[in-house]
Interface confidence: low
């Protein structure tokens, strides 16, 4: 239904706190270099204006669209061209082109320093002094580094942050209370960020239909007792919510997400028996809980999938009459029977089924042609199952750090032209799949592994798009989203690559490495490992292990030495010589 004033409508629906948080996120995601104070000033101005519209919807400018209002605010920022270069050209355009232009200038890898967490005492002091400003800083810092972060979910993480600080700042040992809890929130938020970026990529590159297919598969797995009409309705609503968030329409997105949560809780009987616990929670927690609710118990009496989709004499007629609906019912029926498959796999199977019908329904005897389609699914199912088994076995043998290193070697060989920091980031993220998924029960491993890997590889593709350097990566990234992971897995050593010259300075270390936190030490060692592979792409696992063990021993010895600097300067060159010999 149309409202005289969109901004008043959203302010009323969301309430002041969420309204302000979402506007702050929106501005931080569009203009990623601005300071918190600059954005906070704009947010206050927008909020004051919204209040005047709530009081009188006919007041001047209250009838303008949110894009117009927000865009005008952003374009009024002083020194826009100096700070943002060609993004300032967006301001010469009219809506909706102006907003599209802002979206195109979002930077997935902004040159911002890592978000450093202050030490516990300082955090608690500033949190107690002004909790609102403290949380505002959190929203701003996360949003500018993750310009596609799912906004209502970021409000949820801010709420978690708030609760942790409220609890831990009252404790005697603030540090040991805060660290593990905040680390947990950070880890979950980072995973949420790459997952949402994947959804936006799907929407941007392949449109709403592709996203809706993803949603149908995912929802059918989670709610196998809901009928197809219900799943279609939920998928349509979820697609709208995500389209809005990916498109920068954060107020509409959060509002519609709240509506969807309300609908689900009011219609539990036709959706799932597992929703009640979620529905008892307040809004942000409720929506978050619903998004990761456990799968409902599958109906016991589901007929074989073949009945309607292979054996039925009307398959081609049904397909021809309403292709999307027929394929949608196939995806729904297959997905609700397979919570143990990844969404990516289910979409590959649906694609295979569609291709089979396209081919067979044009032939003289269609049933004879498509009769074997389910058997043809077998290799598609076996491939990711083998991937999971092989990788989880390796993870169990090596542990997370060793597993990351194995992946780093593998991916550096596949795409040695990619920058070392990108390779290290990707390998560390891909390697976390072991900790995240390999400890789960057997039937949950495949969906966890493959859908997580797909999201991480999407980030690899986005970073590579900025500066394309590898034919291999370009090939895998230019295909459909669901084919990316199998494409990357199938890549072998890039034979076209000319090995890098050996530079001693790349492998020269100083005593400052000794005082680095463990994570930073690992990154330094992994950087060296990637550089070794770039120098010797065909080095064997044994050769690389020898070198890395020697390197670890060297660090351990010198970091324990009384005179660290001397140890590094004398033993360092010896290490470099040994490395060269080992790899010769």
């Amino acid at each position: 239904e149309a409202h005289k004033s969109e901004i008043a409508h959203r302010y009323n629906d969301l309430g002041e706190q969420h309204f302000k948080g979402l506007v702050l996120i929106a501005f931080s995601q569009y203009l990623q270099k601005c300071s918190y104070d600059e954005h906070a000033k704009l947010v206050q101005e927008v909020t004051d204006f919204a209040k005047t519209c709530v009081a009188d919807e006919s007041a001047a400018n209250c009838d303008k669209s949110l894009h117009t209002l927000f865009g005008d605010k952003l374009c009024a920022i002083p020194n826009l061209r100096e700070n943002y270069g060609e993004l300032a050209d967006c301001c010469t355009k009219q809506e909706p082109e102006r907003n599209e232009c802002f979206l195109q200038h979002k930077d997935d890898n902004p040159s911002l320093p890592p978000f450093e967490r202050p030490e516990a005492e300082a955090m608690c002091t500033s949190f107690k002094e002004n909790p609102t400003t403290f949380m505002g800083h959190y929203l701003h810092e996360v949003a500018r580094r993750h310009p596609y972060f799912y906004a209502p979910e970021l409000l949820y993480y801010a709420e978690q942050y708030n609760e942790i600080l409220t609890q831990c700042c009252a404790e005697a040992d603030k540090e040991s209370c805060l660290t593990p809890k905040l680390d947990g929130v950070k880890e979950k938020a980072l995973v949420s960020s790459v997952r949402q970026r994947m959804k936006c990529s799907s929407m941007q590159k392949f449109g709403e239909r592709a996203f809706k297919a993803w949603a149908v598969a995912r929802l059918s797995q989670t709610f196998p007792n809901a009928d197809f009409a219900e799943i279609t309705k939920l998928a349509t609503d979820l697609t709208k919510v995500n389209k809005e968030c990916c498109h920068g329409d954060l107020l509409e997105c959060a509002d519609d997400r709240a509506e969807l949560a309300k609908y689900m809780c009011e219609n539990q009987a036709t959706i799932s028996s597992k929703l009640q616990t979620c529905c008892d929670k307040p809004l942000l927690k409720k929506a978050h809980c619903l998004s990761e609710v456990e799968h409902d118990t599958m109906p016991a009496d589901l007929p074989a999938i073949a009945a309607d989709f292979v054996e039925d004499q009307e398959v081609c007629k049904n397909y021809a009459e309403a292709k999307d609906v027929f394929l949608g019912t196939f995806l729904y029926e297959y997905s609700r029977r397979h919570p143990d498959y990844s969404v990516s796999l289910l979409l590959r199977l649906a694609k295979k089924y569609e291709a089979t019908l396209e081919k067979c329904c044009a032939e003289a005897n269609p049933p004879a042609c498509y009769g074997t389609v389910l058997a043809e699914f077998q290799p598609l199912v076996e491939e990711p199952k083998n991937l999971v088994k092989t990788n989880c076995d390796l993870y169990e043998k090596l542990g997370e750090y060793g597993f990351q290193n194995a992946i780093l070697v593998r991916y550096t060989q596949k795409a040695p032209q990619v920058s070392t920091p990108t390779l290290v980031e990707a390998a560390r993220n891909l390697g976390r799949v072991g900790t995240k998924c390999c400890t789960l029960p057997e039937d949950q491993r495949l969906p966890c592994v493959e859908d997580y890997l797909s999201a991480i590889l999407n980030r690899v593709c986005l970073l590579h798009e900025k500066t394309p350097v590898s034919e291999h990566v370009t090939k895998c990234c230019s295909g459909s989203l669901v084919e990316r992971r199998p494409c990357f897995s199938a890549l072998t050593v890039d034979e076209t690559y000319v090995p890098k010259e050996f530079k001693a300075e790349t492998f020269t270390f100083h005593s400052d490495i000794c005082t680095l936190p463990e994570k930073e030490k690992q990154i330094k060692k992994q950087t060296a490992l990637a550089e070794l592979v770039k120098h010797k792409p065909k080095a064997t696992a044994e050769q690389l292990k020898t070198v890395m063990d020697d390197f670890a021993q060297f660090l351990d010895t010198c970091c324990k030495a009384a005179d660290k600097d001397t140890c590094f300067s004398t033993e360092g060159p010896n290490l470099v010589t040994r490395c060269k010999d080992a790899l010769a």
Partner: nanobody
Amino acid sequence: EVQLLESGGGLVQPGGSLRLSCAASGFTLDYYAIGWFRQAPGKEREGVSCIASSGGSTNYADSVKGRFTISRDNSKNTVYLQMNSLRAEDTAVYYCAAAVLECRTVVRGYDYWGQGTQVTVSS
């Protein structure tokens, strides 16, 4: 473009009859359940009747049971609402809406909506 178009509304005396039609263009109705809704001035939109995609399952609001009949002709891509023994309280704008395969219990559950046709029952 996907469209639903209602027709057949008009002014009728109490006790009279009307037959509303809902024609689809841009998609085939075979896979869709069609619901009829009505909205009287100042009131919420309410469900009147619905027919599932197969045509086998139909339902009616208590206030119209025994007086209204819903049917479909998939070859014409059209759904009908036959309204007999009309009463003054049946006066409203009548809308048809489509949802995939099965009837829905809530207004929000329908994917496509028509623009509506006015039915006025008055002497």
